[in-house]
């Protein structure tokens, strides 16, 4: 299929810098409630993260015509292209941070398609040919998902979800209670 884009805009899926999702109730521990989940208080020390926009999983909305040989869709379709970074861990919510965030290296998450939707389009062909009907699969949403050996940085297709396995059987330690207002948004985003 050929694609012709003529418009795009973007939606960012991102928690706000310095705000952390509330830990699950069973993990709460008063001793550590005043600390950030992933390895430090909200950034204020010499090694601050870069601008928050550099670490976002963005849903870019592209409006395109579907083509099939000489035929082109009567109306454009809108789909998403997933773009951006899913790190560093400081900006990732608990939902995907089940590993040990204090380690210098850890689970690699990528911004990739999460859900697809099917859309039927009518293709108009030149030379008086009868219109054709085609069903196309379009990206409906993006998500940060853990990279596995089947995934490739340059090949962002429909990858299966894989949770980060807990290390050595230890529960993750909650390190901060965050603004509840952000929680629902984060759970949906990631």
């Amino acid at each position: 299929q050929g694609w012709q884009a003529f418009k795009n805009d973007a939606t960012e899926i991102i928690p706000e810098l310095g705000e952390y999702p509330e830990p699950p109730p069973e993990l709460e521990n008063n001793k550590t409630m005043n600390r950030a989940e992933n390895g430090g208080r909200p950034p204020h020390h010499p090694f601050e993260t870069k601008d928050v926009s550099e670490y976002s999983c963005r849903e870019l909305h592209f409006t395109r015509y579907v083509t099939d040989g000489p035929c082109r869709s009567a109306k454009p379709v809108t789909e998403l292209v997933c773009s951006g970074q899913c790190g560093p861990a400081r900006l990732l919510p608990n939902a995907i941070g089940r590993g040990k965030w204090w380690r210098p290296s850890g689970p690699d998450f990528r911004c990739i398609p999460d859900r697809y939707r099917a859309q039927r389009v009518q293709l108009l062909c030149p030379g008086g040919e009868a219109p054709r009907a085609r069903k196309v699969r379009l990206v409906a949403s993006c998500k940060c998902k853990r990279l596995t050996r089947f995934h490739n940085q340059s090949e962002l297709k429909d990858f299966g979800t894989e949770a980060a396995r807990p290390q050595k059987g230890r529960k993750p330690r909650p390190r901060a209670r965050s603004a509840k207002a952000n929680q629902a948004e984060l759970e949906n985003a990631y």
Partner: antibody, heavy 119, light 110 residues
């Protein structure tokens, strides 16, 4: 200025013990997970052990498991490595290093202290 | 022998672009983030790249990192004489439950 200063290295016989210390200054100590990384003469880097902010979660390289113990004292801004049953192959320059970002690499390093294990 | 494999040496002339590779497996680079360190002669290592392709503040944008599958690479463009150093890649290994380094690559600026 962010600084990590190692001490406690020296010449020791195989089978003996040594305790390394790392004193931190210039940053909020308990914002950092801390690690020991060593480098044998003329060789590459080898991660030895790491400890989280509060000192209750620890990892070790297989080569030192059961012999070395990492610990930290946040009140004293200090990191320690207790090395028991030392072997000739433990001879190296031992670096103290820290990371402030989750999964963000070791972003602060000391200059190292030399441990020589020889009979 | 190192868990992550790097070429022992690399070289280039000033202004050139050089790339250093780092090969691993599904239990380290294939699943976890990659970091790169620079060690100038007689000094402690310095973090150059973290999380595959992020530069800490103060690191020139001549240095860039990338990762694909179970391999990673460090690219240095506009090579300068002060870039002459040893370069190490590193990643967490889920099987070993250790932070593993590559054997290091000695970069010579001709």
């Amino acid at each position: 200025e962010v600084q990590l200063v190692e001490s406690g290295g020296g010449l020791v016989q195989p089978g003996r013990s040594l305790r390394l210390s790392c004193a931190a200054s210039g940053f909020t100590f308990d914002d950092y997970a801390l690690h020991w990384v060593r480098q044998a003469p003329g060789k590459g880097l080898e991660w030895v052990s790491g400890i989280n902010w509060e000192g209750d979660d620890i990892d070790y390289a297989d080569s030192v498991k059961g012999r070395f113990t990492i610990s930290r004292d946040n009140a004293k801004n200090s990191l320690y490595l207790q090395m028991n049953s030392l072997r000739v192959e433990d001879t190296a320059l031992y670096y103290c290093a820290g990371n402030s970002r989750g999964y963000g690499g070791l972003d602060v390093w000391g200059q190292g202290t030399t441990v020589t294990v020889s009979s | 022998q190192s868990v992550l494999t790097q070429p022992p040496s690399a070289s280039g002339t000033p202004g050139q672009r050089v790339t250093i590779s780092c090969s691993g497996s599904s239990s380290n680079i294939g699943r976890n983030t990659v970091n790169w360190y620079q060690q100038l002669p007689g000094t402690a290592p310095k973090l150059l790249i973290y999380s595959n392709n992020q530069r800490p503040s103060g690191v020139p944008d001549r240095f860039s990192g990338s990762k694909s599958g179970t391999s990673a690479s460090l690219a240095i463009s506009g090579l300068q004489s002060e870039d002459e150093a040893d370069y190490y890649c590193a990643a967490w290994d889920d099987n070993l439950e250790s932070y593993v380094f590559g054997g290091g690559t000695k970069l010579t600026v001709l």
